[in-house]
Interface confidence: low
């Protein structure tokens, strides 16, 4: 993989420890928290990033609760269990033996239970809606220009294939970015929409995960696009299972 050889760092993940102890003295990087080797030529999985983040904890955050089958990450930060490939394990438990099932982006999709709770499979999040509100500008952004700039960003910064950016909607001041990626569409080597959305979320909050890169400077035809709030909705291939109590 391509960790920067000269000073042995991981361009796509600053939450790593790198050393020239790979085969042939090549630079090898391991994620903080898990110690797992990461591929520095692409995005690191959200599970490993959350685990790394928990090794240097910050305050958890809470997001607004949406309706229907869309999930929002209301539970904030937790120390996740990741599988050998860096994906979230379907069942997550905390230190007090409270367990729950998560989707492929690590968001809880069932009520919390005890150690007897079964999560048969990791359910894929196939549709992510990123809802942004931008700060007031002199005029509305041109929709075509805004669309092109956001597509360019997801392609060049997050290495997400443009076919997974299903739509960019704009009604000033709200921008909605729809990411869609079914299990059948995701080929080996494709960046996962959940990972791209997480990197984007952290960029928007000024907490870039990239090594040594400046923060995100989003401009549309030279005009700065400054985001003042972000909401991310997750839709799974199989609807979540919550008790009626939670829905009322």
């Amino acid at each position: 993989h391509t960790a920067a050889q000269d000073n042995c760092t991981c361009p796509t993940n600053k939450m790593t420890v790198c050393s020239p102890d790979g085969p042939g003295g090549r630079c090898q990087c391991r994620a903080l928290g898990s110690g797992m080797a990461v591929d520095c030529s692409t995005l690191t999985s959200k599970c490993l990033l959350l685990k790394a983040r928990m090794s240097a904890p910050k305050n958890a955050r809470t997001l607004v609760r949406p309706s229907e089958h869309a999930l929002v990450d209301n539970d904030g930060l937790y120390d996740p269990d990741c599988d050998p490939e860096g994906r979230f394990k379907a069942r997550q438990c905390n230190q007090t033996s409270v367990c729950w099932c998560v989707n492929s982006v690590g968001v809880r999709r069932t009520d919390k239970g005890d150690l007897s709770l079964r999560c048969d499979e990791l359910v894929r999040t196939h549709h992510i809606l990123i809802d942004l509100r931008h700060r007031p500008t002199a005029g509305a952004f041109n929709h075509s220009d805004l669309d092109a700039e956001l597509r360019r960003l997801f392609r060049e910064r997050y290495r997400l294939h443009p076919k997974f950016v299903a739509a960019v909607h704009y009604e000033q001041p709200t921008i909605q970015i729809e990411l869609r990626q079914n299990t059948s569409q995701k080929a080996a080597g494709d960046v996962d929409i959940g990972d791209a959305a997480y990197y984007f979320e952290r960029d928007i909050k000024g907490e870039s995960l990239f090594q040594g890169r400046g923060g995100l400077d989003l401009r549309v035809r030279g005009e700065p696009l400054q985001v003042e709030r972000t909401l991310i909705y997750y839709l799974d291939e199989i609807p979540p299972k919550f008790s009626m109590k939670r829905l009322t």
Partner: antibody
Framework: EVQLVESGGGLIQPGGSLKLSCAAS????????MNWVRQAPGKGLEWMGR????????HYNQKFKDRVTMTRDTSTSTVYMELSSLRSEDTAVYYC??????????????WGQGTTVTVSS | AIRMTQSPFSLSASVGDRVTITCKAS??????VAWYLQKPGQSPQLLIY???YRYTGVPDRFSGSGSGTDFTLKISRVEAEDVGVYYC?????????FGQGTRLEIK
Amino acid sequence: EVQLVESGGGLIQPGGSLKLSCAASGFTVSNYWMNWVRQAPGKGLEWMGRIDPNDSETHYNQKFKDRVTMTRDTSTSTVYMELSSLRSEDTAVYYCARSGFGSTYWFFDVWGQGTTVTVSS
Amino acid sequence: AIRMTQSPFSLSASVGDRVTITCKASQDVSTAVAWYLQKPGQSPQLLIYSASYRYTGVPDRFSGSGSGTDFTLKISRVEAEDVGVYYCQQHYSTPLTFGQGTRLEIK
């Protein structure tokens, strides 16, 4: 300048085949589907299919499925369309046009000038 | 395949007139409809996409509306340069399909 330039048209015998080229410049080809649309003399527009220049994924109009092949050469930002078993009804202007990924953007914002194909003995 | 039916087939207008062209889809296409103008001897050019978004550089006398199955292109004040054939296209699903075209002439 964003540009698409088609070439390869001309007079072709019935039963023969054609291979048209579309050279793209002024934009990142990998960010777009590259489409072929044709227009018979005095008639409307007909979508033939498209190719994703990243991985050569193709979607063809069922009408042409058995006769059309679309390919690409990323090193030259060129896409190709081959049409076989030509008949007189294939006489048309053939356009190359780009469209975005995601169905919200499957419209054609840039078109080539078109290349004329005449099928006649 | 989704069929797109345009009307009228042709129309004649004077400079300054208001013109309306309609397009009907054979099934619900949400707002995924684009409009093009093909001037004589030229390639088609995009005017409107997603039913109502004017493409960059298109004069504001062109406007689009509609959703579901019924769509409209309006030209508020026709100019001499607007002559040609107007096509609607659904960009909802493949195969992508066009209307048969509406020819606009200037009286």
